[in-house]
């Protein structure tokens, strides 16, 4: 999958764009909005109705390196009087996010834009019944 | 810094910490080969806590095209069907990681960003303060 | 066609404990749960508890919570039962079933049955 | 927890007949599955949902009821039949069974 040139005609390459060379891109690290914080929406992980764990996942060549996935809890979800309700599913939501990867080849090094997938909660789904005719 | 093992051989000039600009391939390697993304596709209208999806489009981002979740309701669907106001719907938000042209309008120089998405939502009890 | 292959029998001492396997193939393994019930000597199918490999949900009949633990190798496409403290009563025929893949069907929906695995527990 | 009681226990009955199997549960379920278990054998997948026939089922089988008393038909017994029946749902945790009704071919 490769990244898409800027496709608008409004848009002219600036003179101030840095040479690249082909097949590849200059890509800068220093996150924009890295001091950005979530306001932790007061662990909702432990009050939804198909609550979920958090685990961080560690690889070094990886930027950035730490990966927080959420794995839900249960299968079903969990009703008014605190049991699990299993005529409903806990379902994890997932989102895509970019990371660099670090590729040691021989005594080169070289980077990769990986996509992954990140499952951030879970949510309670009522699943398809499909009734016969 | 982190450690990374590295051939004996090799000159030990490297820092052992990403740096700061690098050059990436154009093309981007994709972990998700198994998952299956229609499964998932409709979890919005199923959901206890459903919600829509708006585009958010910039095409200084890559990638361009970004969903963002907006719960339906304030409360939570209960098993007739209504809306039950003793629970919440609550949106569930994940930094992302994205690249943003720069200088802007360049095709082949970008820097990484941290944005902030509602991805889906979820149904809560609330937190009752009792009065002492 | 779906498969699920389980160990083979065990003999153990009391206060032991004991894993079973089962490999999953004919199927996308993360996309289905997978549960795990017990049948005692003539006696009725008891549900232990299931599994979901892809979000790690777990579910567990209250009567096996400290006495199994189900657990995953998505890599393997295999999942685990292990019992533990292993007592006489424990003494039985184990199956790994599949369940339902919460999109198309609910996850407690049980289609395809392992051969099942027998674990004695004897002094 | 749903307790499931099958009735009877037991049956002996003749090829060609027809085989009623009930399954009365201590609270409303929405569904039920029925399995069979032939000798040395794991248990197999009969109907889902009530009424709905696995794939591979032959059509003598059939299923119904509704609220607490459910009901597998077998329309034209076989001998291949004999086998334990169970009774299943997954409406209300834990998922459970019924205690089996063990059909013996004459």
């Known amino acids: 999958r490769k990244i898409p040139k800027v496709g608008h005609t409004f848009f002219q390459k600036p003179e101030s764009c840095p040479p690249v060379p082909g097949g590849s891109m200059k890509l800068d690290i220093g996150i924009i909005n890295e001091n950005q914080r979530v306001s932790m929406s007061r662990n909702i992980e432990s009050r939804s109705t198909s609550p979920w764990n958090y685990t961080v996942t560690w690889d070094p060549n990886r930027y950035p390196s730490e990966v927080v996935q959420a794995q839900c809890r249960n299968l079903g979800c969990i009703n008014a009087q605190g049991k699990e309700d299993i005529s409903m599913n806990s379902v994890p939501i997932q989102q895509e996010t970019l990371v660099v990867r670090r590729k040691h080849q021989g005594c080169s090094v070289s980077f990769q834009l990986e996509k992954v997938l990140v499952t951030v909660g879970c949510t309670c789904v009522t699943p398809v019944i499909h009734h016969v005719q | 810094g982190i450690t990374i093992p590295r051939n004996p051989g090799c000159p030990n000039s490297e820092d052992k910490n990403f740096p700061r600009t690098v050059m990436v391939n154009l093309n981007i390697h994709n972990r998700n080969t198994n998952t299956n993304p229609k499964r998932s596709s409709d979890y919005y209208n199923r959901s206890t806590s459903p919600w829509n999806l708006h585009r958010n489009e910039d095409p200084e981002r890559y990638p361009s095209v970004i969903w963002e979740a907006k719960c339906r309701h304030l409360g939570c669907i209960n098993a007739d069907g209504n809306v039950d106001y003793h629970m919440n719907s609550v949106p569930i938000q994940q930094e992302i990681l994205v690249l943003r042209r720069e200088p802007p309008h360049c095709p082949n120089s970008f820097r990484l960003e941290k944005i902030l998405v509602s991805v889906g939502c979820t149904c809560v009890t609330p937190i009752v303060h009792h009065v002492a | 066609q779906v498969q699920l292959v389980q160990s083979g029998a065990e003999v153990k001492k009391p206060g032991a404990s004991v894993k079973v396997s089962c490999k999953a193939s004919?199927?996308?393994?993360?996309?289905?749960?997978m549960h795990w019930v017990k049948q005692s000597h003539g006696q009725r199918l008891e549900w232990m508890g299931g599994?979901?490999?892809?979000?790690?949900?777990?579910s567990y009949n209250q009567n096996f919570k400290g006495k199994a633990t189900l657990t995953v190798d998505t890599s393997a496409s295999t999942a685990y039962m292990e019992l533990s403290s292993l007592r006489s009563e424990d003494t039985a025929v184990y199956y790994c079933?599949?369940?339902?893949?919460?999109?198309?069907?609910?996850?407690?929906?049980?289609?395809?049955w392992g051969q099942g695995t027998t674990v004695t527990v004897s002094s | 927890e749903i307790v499931l009681t099958q009735s009877p226990d037991f049956q002996s009955v003749t090829p060609k007949e027809k085989v009623t199997i009930t399954c009365s549960a201590s609270s409303s379920v929405n569904y039920m599955h029925w399995y069979q278990q032939k000798p040395d054998q794991s248990p197999k997948l009969l109907i889902k949902?009530?009424?709905k026939l696995a794939s591979g089922v032959p059509s003598r089988f059939s299923g119904s009821g509704s609220g607490t008393d459910f009901t597998l038909t077998i329309n034209s017994l076989e001998a291949e039949d004999a086998a334990t029946y169970y009774c299943q749902q997954w409406n209300s945790h834990p998922l459970t069974f019924g205690q089996g009704t063990k059909l013996e071919i004459k």
């Open positions: 949902d009530t009424s």
């Open positions: 599994i979901n490999p892809n979000s790690g949900g777990v």
């Open positions: 079933a599949r369940g339902g893949d919460g999109y198309y069907t609910n996850y407690f929906d049980i289609d395809y």
């Open positions: 004919g199927y996308t393994f993360n996309e289905y749960t």
